[in-house]
């Protein structure tokens, strides 16, 4: 039956990236206010965003507890006001978002290299271990730490006097590859999670190219 | 008139459990949320929980989440908080008080009940 | 959290006089889409229960004196009591009921000097 005067939300969609995930909805109160709850497929519900007149509730602090669970979540659409003041006391209305599993569906974020060095005809590119908001006893993992090597990065690298790319792969966060000599190289990494159905592939990192300060140049 | 008239408080030991109840009447109790608040010995006051008219929602402070769990009996009139694993610093008198004209605004609370956390 | 500071903490004031408390938001609780503070203040009186005065930081609630008045906006509100009475004498708590969890200020003892 629902409340007076109250709608039921709709176009409940997740936005996460490495595991900062936020569920949004429409539309925006009037009138009305809104709880969220979050819920593994097994687990009790939990009230999130209490009485919250925003449309967007962050439930990173819920899925990180456990990233391979399916969650689901709800949105309850109350009067803005007492109950009793506003009509009917029935059932509140809410509406289902699609289940999420963040192990599964979480973007990759875009990645940085941190640094390359070249010595002699080699050179190693360090891809940066970003940073989760998923926690281990008391510290936060990385994304290496999270998704081990179900995580690989592909490279792309070409002269800087040319566009032919070519790729290389690696299942940890560094690329040891070999390079012409005296010639100055680009590079920009991608995550890749290549067992995944969905959101399989991060944005490209911005590109860095040697003789820039990232690098760091060895005659041998 | 409406009134709310707390009970269950009491002297009890660190790590034990306490249920406070909290009688309504004079109002539709099922059309009103209603929250928990407690005020520790001459100190200020401090949220502590809240349930929607509904029962469906509830939201607590963290200083008791996993502790404490607040419930209702909409066909009893009666609001309850069920305090396990009880600290000294839970010492204090717990107020049950109903939303007013908005949610978290109280109109109306209960007189207290004094909980005591000693050894 | 929203973090609430009341001062002063202390207030001796004259019968008849003038007092004036003050309450600051960590964030602001005015919502834009309504243009309404949601901000309440209480007295609680020794062995009492507190008891609303006002909400939406200036609508007084129903039989409250009018002595008793609100204003502020966003982040700096105040209360003031016109003319100080012998029964006004206790503490005064500001709460905002903007997001949760909801929050209290520390109080303002007023007593007359």
């Known amino acids: 039956s629902g409340t007076t005067n109250t709608v039921a939300a709709y176009n409940l969609t997740w936005k996460s990236t490495n595991f900062k995930t936020i569920l949004e909805w429409e539309p925006k109160p009037v009138n009305q206010v809104y709880t969220v709850q979050i819920s593994t497929k097994s687990g009790d519900w939990k009230s999130k965003c209490f009485y919250t007149t925003d449309t967007e509730c962050d439930l990173t602090d819920e899925i990180v507890k456990d990233v391979k669970q399916t969650y689901l979540a709800r949105v309850f659409s109350y009067p803005a006001g007492n109950v009793e003041s506003t009509g009917s006391a029935g059932e509140p209305l809410y509406e289902n978002s699609p289940e999420f599993t963040p192990y599964l569906e979480t973007n990759l974020g875009q990645p940085t290299i941190q640094s390359f060095e070249q010595v002699g005809t080699k050179v190693n590119v360090t891809v940066e271990d970003e940073r989760t908001l998923v926690r281990r006893n008391n510290t936060f993992l990385s994304l290496r730490d999270v998704f081990g090597k179900d995580l690989i990065y592909t490279l792309y690298y070409w002269k800087s006097s040319s566009s032919g790319k070519k790729t290389a792969k690696t299942n940890t966060n560094e690329f040891l590859i070999d390079v012409d000599k005296g010639e100055n190289y680009c590079f920009s990494v991608q995550a890749v999670i290549p067992s995944r159905t969905v959101n399989r592939k991060s944005t490209d990192s911005p590109v860095e190219c040697m003789g820039q300060e990232k690098g760091e140049f060895r005659e041998i | 008139q409406v009134q709310l008239v707390e009970s269950g408080g009491g002297v009890v030991q660190p790590g034990r459990s306490l249920r406070l109840s909290c009688a309504a009447s004079?109002?539709?109790?099922?059309?009103?949320?209603m929250h928990w608040v407690r005020q520790a010995p001459g100190k200020g006051l401090e949220w502590v929980a809240v349930?929607?008219?509904?029962?469906?929602?509830?939201y607590y402070a963290d200083s008791v989440e996993g502790r404490f769990t607040i419930s209702r009996d909409n066909s009893k009139n009666t609001l309850y908080l069920q305090m396990n694993s009880l600290r000294a610093e839970d010492t204090a008198v717990y107020y049950c008080?109903?939303?007013?004209?908005?949610?978290?605004?109280?109109?109306?609370w209960g007189q207290g009940t004094l909980v005591t956390v000693s050894s | 959290d929203i973090v609430m500071t009341q001062s002063p903490d202390s207030l001796a004031v004259s019968l008849g006089e003038r007092a004036t408390i003050n309450c600051k938001s960590s964030?602001?609780?005015?919502?834009?889409?309504?243009?309404?503070?949601?901000l309440a203040w209480y007295q609680q009186k020794p062995g009492q229960p507190p008891k609303l005065l006002i909400y939406?930081?200036?609508t007084r609630e129903s039989g409250v004196p009018d002595r008793f008045s609100g204003s502020g906006s966003g982040t700096d509100f105040t209360l003031t009591i016109s003319s100080l009475q012998a029964e006004d004498v206790a503490v005064y708590y500001c709460?905002?009921?903007?997001?949760?969890?909801?929050?209290f200020g520390g109080g303002t003892k007023v007593e007359i000097k």
């Open positions: 939406w930081a200036s």
């Open positions: 008080a109903r939303d007013g004209v908005y949610y978290g605004v109280y109109d109306y």
């Open positions: 349930i929607t008219y509904d029962g469906i929602n509830k």
């Open positions: 709460q905002q009921f903007h997001s949760y969890p909801l929050t």
């Open positions: 004079g109002f539709t109790f099922h059309s009103r949320g």
């Open positions: 964030q602001s609780v005015l919502f834009s889409s309504n243009n309404k503070n949601y």
